[in-house]
Interface confidence: low
Amino acid sequence: NIDVCKLGTVTVQPAPVIPLGSAANISCSLNPKQGCSHYPSSNELILLKFVNDVLVENLHGKKVHDHTGHSSTFQVTNLSLGMTLFVCKLNCSNSQKKPPVPVCGVEISVGVAPEPPQNISCVQEGENGTVACSWNSGKVTYLKTNYTLQLSGPNNLTCQKQCFSDNRQNCNRLDLGINLSPDLAESRFIVRVTAINDLGNSSSLPHTFTFLDIVIPLPPWDIRINFLNASGSRGTLQWEDEGQVVLNQLRYQPLNSTSWNMVNATNAKGKYDLRDLRPFTEYEFQISSKLHLSGGSWSNWSESLRTRTPEEEPVGILDIWYMKQDIDYDRQQISLFWKSLNPSEARGKILHYQVTLQEVTKKTTLQNTTRHTSWTRVIPRTGAWTASVSAANSKGASAPTHINIVDLCGTGLLAPHQVSAKSENMDNILVTWQPPKKADSAVREYIVEWRALQPGSITKFPPHWLRIPPDNMSALISENIKPYICYEIRVHALSESQGGCSSIRGDSKHKAPVSGPHITAITEKKERLFISWTHIPFPEQRGCILHYRIYWKERDSTAQPELCEIQYRRSQNSHPISSLQPRVTYVLWMTAVTAAGESPQGNEREFCPQGKAN
């Protein structure tokens, strides 16, 4: 740990702080009686240049003056912005083994004079806040630069604060620590920022403002809302504000919305009535404040108030549908179904549904409440029945929806014509039809009903349906439509007291089935063969099956097989063929066909008919 400046001194001309592009002369001098022992003439002074503690240059060739063995002067040029360290070392040339000894060092700072500060902006946050100003300092000076913020105002008011910028911190904002009060509302204030460093100084233009120009109110706080008589649409928003606030801006929106409702309120005094809220809806409310109607700045938005409006009784009409099934000669099962109200109609949490089944002559009335969206009852087959359903939340019930229970497919004259089902894409099917040809009574509406054709679907799954006005002849069905599944689609035409229907099968996308039907038995009756099979499992059908094909050929024959194509019916699982020769052994198999193609063959069965040939 040697004292690096015990051996000598280093000086800089013109100064250790220079403008960018200037040169400097660095002189290194040994103190008396210092240097290489016995041989003063062998003293060699060298100058090393370091940037960020890394040696970048030996300035041996930049000597401009030399007193042998006593002092040397070096000229340095092209110094980059920032700080550069120069270290003078003594090299005793007679002793090659000893490294040069440090004599002394100097730091040279290269920078620029400060530019005049610009874009001064001052704010006072809240009536009790303090004035703080910020500015744009201009180009970086690379030197320690002092900034002074001066404020002057009425009644000889003066105030100033200082800060500095260097390579570790930036000074472009100062808080004066003084509070401007509302009684100075009309007064004018002037601020100026002065910048000084070792290479020069500059001053901003004066910036003039009034109390209203710079005071930004604090955002409102403690926001709350009271709902008048627990109303779901009317509420009084309340908040705390600073005393001088004369104007508020309110914004509010349902939580899932993307656009705000905006309201301006003058002299609200922390209270505002809202009248257009949606019941049972999560809302977000925010408020901003201003101290003057025309001038001044808005506060930041307050933190949000998030709350849910109270419930109101449901509005809207339930969409009801039903199924009828005869149980025996004098009883029938009625299954009622309905769709949930959408949130804007439910206006609360639906607690239950009130269901009524009534015989029109008022002889019998069945009533019940249920939390489900379906209800099943057994009623007599005699009499004309009507059903009604209403939805109830904590505030009340919707108006009941009525529907007449008619024989849905009972009137052939009301059956829609030319029903077709075309796949539109993976998720929907376009159903079209023509109106009934000879309807006795006017069609009041069409109902398109669909359900997957899978085992137990009638009992397990409720139907899906769409109500269609009487002048429309098409429907795009998409709810619960999945690709590669066959749906039974019914189009019902309903009049006041009758119903007619037509049925079709359809799918939204199809592939050839995975396998063919499995032949379970071949029996011979009266010189005809009856082929029996089990249907393809539901997941392997991959759409609506259009036909089954029965193939046969003589065993060991290389000829093309013969085939019989059967229209697919779900209820059919056997079919006769009668063109086989007796006492010839045949191989038989089956395939299934969808609109996409034919399945691989099912199992093969051999059979040798015994009867005489046809």
Epitope: I223, R224, E282, S302, E303, L305, T307
Partner: nanobody
Framework: QVQLQESGGGLVQAGGSLRLSCASS????????VGWFRQAPGKERYFVAA????????DYADSVKGRFTISRGNAKNTVYLQMNSLNPEDTAVYYC?????????????????????WGQGTQVTVSS
């Protein structure tokens, strides 16, 4: 700005009780939903309980229902979590949190993202 300070944690035998406190000097604390969350080592932060601004609504994680009770003090600037029938699975650092919104009387959230201000946490250790 809302500063929160939890206290009341410590070591307790299984079956014992502790009462955690969450204090705040912020003037808006009483206007916010306040929740307790806990975090066991190596696990995610887990919702425990929450109370609405006017104490009308409370919510609890299924695992603590019937054992823990959340409440607000009379001055509204403290929220308590009374923990009874503690078991070793309750061992964790317990954090108090205040919502980043003024919450309406109906509003309670179990999502940590709905809470902006958090305390430093207090350690609760339940030994068997």
């Amino acid at each position: 700005q809302v500063q929160l300070q939890e206290s009341g944690g410590g070591l307790v035998q299984a079956g014992g009780s502790l009462r955690l406190s969450c204090a705040s000097s912020g003037r808006t604390f009483s206007s916010r939903t306040v929740g307790w969350f806990r975090q066991a080592p190596g696990k995610e932060r887990y919702f425990v309980a929450a109370i609405s601004r006017d104490t009308a609504y409370t919510d609890y994680a299924d695992s603590v229902k019937g054992r823990f009770t959340i409440s607000r003090g009379n001055a509204k600037n403290t929220v308590y979590l009374q923990m009874n029938s503690l078991n070793p699975e309750d061992t964790a650092v317990y954090y108090c949190a205040a919502s980043h919104i003024y919450s309406g009387s109906h509003y309670i959230s179990a999502r940590s993202s709905d809470y902006m201000y958090w305390g430093q946490g207090t350690q609760v250790t339940v030994s068997s």
